[in-house]
């Protein structure tokens, strides 16, 4: 059993051009985390398994927002190591596979977004014990520096952590009369004591006193970088004019990489950077399989038909991306019919309809001669695929639910005064005038114009109470006919009220889930 | 091979409760949603809830028919989910599967849980 | 929470013949329709995704086809190890539902 340890350095813009300043999108600030995953690479049997070494998911970063003209640094990283036990013994052989997510912190309904910023996948061999090993690896346009070492947890000891051992201290377990001990048990050592001042960072011993440098490292503590020429790398016949060496046959010629991956030439060799889903020496081994969950959010992992992929991810509504680590805006497509305002929650779009709307894309017009929709005694009228209300006197708007004032129109003849009342309108004639609209003439012998009508009533004539009680009456039976419309109309818009309010409630249930 | 195993189910009372098992090898547990699904007796099947990764905080999801009577936890070290059902009723008795992902594209064999006095 | 409805219930054929399994849903789902499979004292496993993409290993005599509210899953020619209970479920809106079931039996 032991402990494989990894420890990123830094994560950041590549050298050269075209390098992105920010790992962030526009979308505001992000943080970075890493997905470390091992797998024995001793065969293809084992390369095509999950991580069956481990794998381990690093802590958030801080949080890190791109200042504007600032140079790209080398990013903000998560604290501590990156830790993978293993139960088993250590295989030597490994494949190293080291994931860069971004989370982005944006404004965003139903959680942050995470994306694959870059994916390194190496086979190595390390010996359990030994010192930090140092990589540069490119992916894409960034570069990633790390460390990694397996060790051992006592009592295992060894190069595989295979042999067990006690404390030199610890009095011997064999006592008179039994049997040898084990002969797996060792003696434990403790680690050597480096020579004073050697690097922690760049030097490690295996003797008591000795300061062993790693590679790019020299000097007495390893503290000197290693110089580089520029002529590094070619080959062919000397040049006489440059010092340096004329180019021969490069090592990519006829592309040595496989599935798809393209070659860079290195120093007296070359390098495959593989597509996704593979890696080895010549991206020969399948990396990734739909074992490891290589799909974020829930995406079904599918084999890939074609060689150039080791497998596909179906993304669940949402979400999109090679990985399904991008979330999509579903809401920019406007779904919600009417002016219904929409919210992504994630796994569900949902639209709060605006008044007099309703279904989940808020398609249904409520307010249509089949809903009743004419208010305050209006009459619905249809035609053409639309409808319109006529109101009822004193009413007017779309749905009769705007006060009119009846007076605006000047109905009341000959002086009359107009006086605006729930039913309509009342008009107190001038003298010398009657009815509805003070439209008849009275005769000044107390006979109207008309032969049929009553006689006037002239100011103080003590049957205009009478007239007047009726009048009130009348007006009474109006209003208790309106009431009577308004809480038919109030019954039936509650029954769309509480389906609205619950739509609500599931919403806020869904978005605080 | 990719294998879920459930295990837990049994006989309990009405108001009674039971813990569920769920152990996976052949995948990278940590990297997958998990979810529980039950089929009572003779019926279709029916979500019961779901867990999501350490880096989403292990947020988890419930049908309303459960909601604060059951629990679902995961520990990544030991690739097992777990079902924690409290106040159990009689609709409760079902077979009941854990899968993974948003498409329960992996299926256990399923674990009997009886609620009946 | 969206509700599928399946038909028929019971589907009696032929090894050989050709089934038709139909789902319904109460609103649109896009294609976020899978099928299942089930057969007796097993537990359910998955055919086809997305509406019409056969999952890993699925013979291809398993189709299926539709988008919005009506879908179909469809048996080229019935093995005597497709008689089973079939589901229809949709992954559109959270929770994911299942259909009532279909089940295809020998005639």
């Known amino acids: 059993a032991g402990v494989f340890e990894l420890q990123i350095h830094s994560f950041g813009p590549g050298p050269g051009p075209g390098a992105p300043r920010s790992p962030c999108s526009a979308r505001g600030p992000c943080r970075l985390f890493f997905r470390v995953c091992l797998k024995p690479g001793l065969s293809e049997e084992a390369a095509e398994s999950p991580c069956a070494l481990g794998a381990a998911l690093s802590a958030r970063g801080p949080v890190y927002t791109e200042q504007p003209e600032a140079p790209a640094p080398d990013l903000p990283l998560p604290n501590g190591l990156l830790q993978v036990p293993f139960r088993d013994a250590w295989p030597g052989t490994f494949s190293l596979i080291i994931e860069t997510w971004r989370e982005e912190l944006g404004d965003q309904i139903g959680g942050p977004a995470w994306s694959l910023l870059a994916r390194v996948t190496r086979r190595r061999r390390l010996a359990a014990g030994g010192p930090w090993a140092r990589d540069i690896q490119r992916a894409g346009a960034w570069e990633l520096r790390f460390s990694y070492r397996a060790r051992c947890e006592l009592p295992a000891v060894g190069t595989a952590c295979t042999r067990l051992c006690r404390p030199r201290s610890a009095p011997s377990r064999c006592g008179p009369g039994l049997r040898p001990c084990a002969p797996l048990e060792d003696e434990c050592e403790a680690p050597p004591v480096c020579r004073a001042g050697c690097s922690l960072e760049h030097g490690f011993c295996e003797q008591p006193g000795e300061c062993r440098c790693l590679e790019g490292w020299t000097g007495p503590l390893c503290m000197v970088p290693v110089s580089t020429s520029s002529c590094l790398g070619l080959r062919g016949p000397s040049s006489t004019t440059t010092g340096c060496l004329v180019p021969g046959p490069g090592p990519c010629d006829g592309n040595p990489c496989a599935n798809g991956g393209s070659c860079s030439e290195t120093p007296g060799s070359f390098e495959c950077t593989c597509p996704r889903g593979f890696y080895g020496l010549r991206c020969e081994v399948s990396g990734v399989t739909c074992a490891d969950g290589p799909c974020f959010n829930g995406g079904l992992c599918v084999g890939g038909a074609d060689p150039d992929s080791a497998y596909i991810c179906h993304c669940p509504p949402g979400f999109q991306g090679s990985n399904c680590e991008k979330r999509v805006d579903r809401c920019s497509l406007q779904p919600c019919r009417n002016g219904g305002l929409c919210l992504d929650l994630g796994h569900a779009l949902r639209c709060r309809c605006r008044a007099g709307f309703a279904g989940p894309r808020c398609e249904h017009d409520l307010d249509d001669c089949a809903g009743r929709a004419c208010a305050n005694g209006g009459t619905c009228v249809e035609g053409g695929g639309a409808h319109r209300c006529s109101c009822a006197l004193g009413f007017g708007g779309r749905n009769c639910r705007e006060r009119a004032d009846p007076c605006a129109a000047r109905p009341c003849a000959h002086g009359g005064r107009c006086y605006a009342h729930f039913s309509g309108l009342v008009c107190a004639c001038a003298p010398g005038y009657m009815g509805a609209r003070c439209e008849f003439p009275v005769h000044p012998d107390g006979v109207s114009a008309l032969p049929a009508a009553p006689p006037g009533l002239r100011p103080g004539d003590p049957q205009r109470a009478g007239v007047i009680a009726v009048i009130v009456v009348v007006v009474i039976a109006i209003v208790a006919g309106i009431v009577v419309l308004v809480i038919s109309r109030k019954k039936r818009m509650a029954k769309y009220e509480k389906a609205e309010i619950k739509e609500m409630g599931e919403m806020h249930r869904e978005l605080n889930a | 091979e990719v294998q879920l195993v459930e295990s837990g189910g049994g006989l309990v009372k009405p108001g009674g409760s039971l813990r569920l098992s769920c152990a996976a090898s052949?995948?990278?547990?940590?990297?997958?949603?998990m979810n529980w699904v039950r089929q009572a007796p003779g019926k279709g099947l029916e979500w019961v809830g779901q867990?999501?990764?350490?880096?989403?905080?292990?947020?988890?999801h419930y049908a309303e028919s459960v909601k604060g009577r059951f629990t679902i936890s995961r520990e990544d070290s030991k690739n097992t989910v777990y079902l924690q059902m409290n106040s159990l009723k009689t609709e409760d008795t079902a077979v009941y599967y854990c899968?993974?992902?948003?498409?329960?594209?992996?299926w256990g064999q399923g674990t009997t849980v009886t609620v009946s006095s | 929470n969206i509700v599928l409805t399946q038909s028929p219930a019971t589907l009696s054929l032929s090894p050989g013949e050709r089934a038709t399994l139909s789902c319904k849903a109460s609103e649109n789902v896009g294609t976020y329709v899978s099928w299942f499979q089930q057969k007796p004292g097993q537990s359910p496993r998955l055919l086809i995704y997305g509406a019409s993409n056969r999952y890993t290993g699925i013979p291809a005599r398993f189709s299926g086809s539709g988008s919005g509210t009506d879908f179909t899953l469809t048996i080229s020619s019935l093995e005597p190890e497709d008689f089973a209970v079939y589901y229809c479920?949709?992954?559109?809106?959270?929770?994911?539902?299942f259909g009532g079931g279909t089940k295809v039996e020998i005639k």
């Open positions: 899968t993974t992902g948003y498409y329960f594209d992996y």
């Open positions: 479920g949709q992954f559109y809106s959270f929770p994911s539902t």
């Open positions: 867990i999501r990764l350490k880096s989403e905080d292990y947020a988890t």
């Open positions: 052949g995948i990278t547990f940590s990297n997958f949603w």
